[in-house]
């Protein structure tokens, strides 16, 4: 029986092989139990974590992970050399930078060592699974009496990232947001000097170097102005 699973992250279909063994009527052997789905994320192209829900197993099982790259010079099957554990049971594998090849199809295989025929294979496009670190060093600059410019830094090549800026005043119930491309500059043309503003930014590996759906964590917020800003115009750029 060959079952195709549609993965939710825009990657290639994952083909999972379930092997049926001879069995008594009205029962299935352990080899037919589906293995948990493996989820991989590449953090800032520094390392990758591939994890699975170990608690979904009917009994504690140290599942093993192998990987390789399809149709490439790196197509030799590799064993996981750095397992992640949850309550002393394997629940993931960490791969280092030298083992990450973004633009080759990554094949990951999960296996039950006690039942070797029970295995699941998924194919992933790693460039769609990159999550950058949160933006850092937010700064605000006054361009004119009513215009602010927000700048920030990323610990990755700027041109690979797009950004989402959110801001609000103390009077607002919700954030206003604005998409920003790889140039990573944002300006607010009309600032009310009576209000205190809060800004934050997150980044995504899209659309130039990959097609990731997941955003980074939010930056630390930065603030501008205060309720008493008329009396004290130098109260600005207060880091949270």
């Amino acid at each position: 029986l060959n079952t195709t699973i549609l993965t939710p992250n825009g990657n290639e279909d994952a083909t999972t092989d379930f092997f049926l063994t001879s069995m008594p009527t009205d029962s299935l052997s352990v080899s037919t139990l589906p293995l948990p789905e493996v989820q991989c994320f590449v953090f800032n192209v520094e390392y990758m974590n591939c994890t699975w829900n170990s608690s979904s197993e009917p009994q504690p099982t140290n599942l093993t992970l192998h990987y390789w790259y399809k149709n490439s010079d790196n197509d030799k099957v590799q064993k996981c050399s750095h397992y992640l554990f949850s309550e002393e049971i394997t629940s993931g594998c960490q791969l280092q930078k030298k083992e990450i090849h973004l633009y080759q199809t990554f094949v990951v295989q999960l296996q039950d060592p006690r039942e070797p025929r029970r295995q699941a294979t998924q194919m992933l496009k790693l460039q769609n699974l990159v999550i950058p670190w949160a933006p850092e060093n937010l700064t605000l600059r006054k361009l004119s009496e009513s215009q602010l410019e927000l700048n920030w830094n990323n610990r990755f090549l700027n041109h690979c990232l797009e950004h989402l800026v959110q801001y609000r005043t103390d009077w607002d119930h919700s954030w206003t947001e604005q998409s920003v491309d790889y140039r990573h500059k944002f300006s607010l043309p009309s600032v009310d000097g009576q209000k205190r503003y809060t800004f934050r930014v997150r980044s995504r590996f899209n659309p130039l170097c990959g097609s990731a759906q997941h955003w980074s964590e939010w930056s630390h917020p930065i603030h501008w102005g205060s309720n008493s800003s008329k009396e004290n115009p130098f109260l600005f750029a207060l880091e949270a």
Partner: nanobody
Framework: QVQLQESGGGLVQPGGSLRLSCTAS????????MTWARQAPGKGLEWVST????????AYAASVEGRFTISRDNAKSTLYLQLNSLKTEDTAMYYC??????????PGQGTQVTVSS
Amino acid sequence: QVQLQESGGGLVQPGGSLRLSCTASGFSFSSYPMTWARQAPGKGLEWVSTIASDGGSTAYAASVEGRFTISRDNAKSTLYLQLNSLKTEDTAMYYCTKGYGDGTPAPGQGTQVTVSS
């Protein structure tokens, strides 16, 4: 074996144009973003432009935006850079690289662009 061969450089007057090409082999060209970088005499390698694997997205250094245009032909495994309104400060060795320009792998041999009157 990854091979990148740049061509199309030359001597041109300020305000002139050139079209650089980079022919790639030894890897799945259509799977990779591709990047142009340059190195002026006595300077470090400077990122110029990157194009997505499908050609649908591009990015440019501020110094060349609006004057240079990156493009690619995946069927021919070839990357291009159209250089318009050239300035003397564009004088450099121009390199194409596989990927997004993080310095690995090393670029090809390069093609020299000299802008002078």
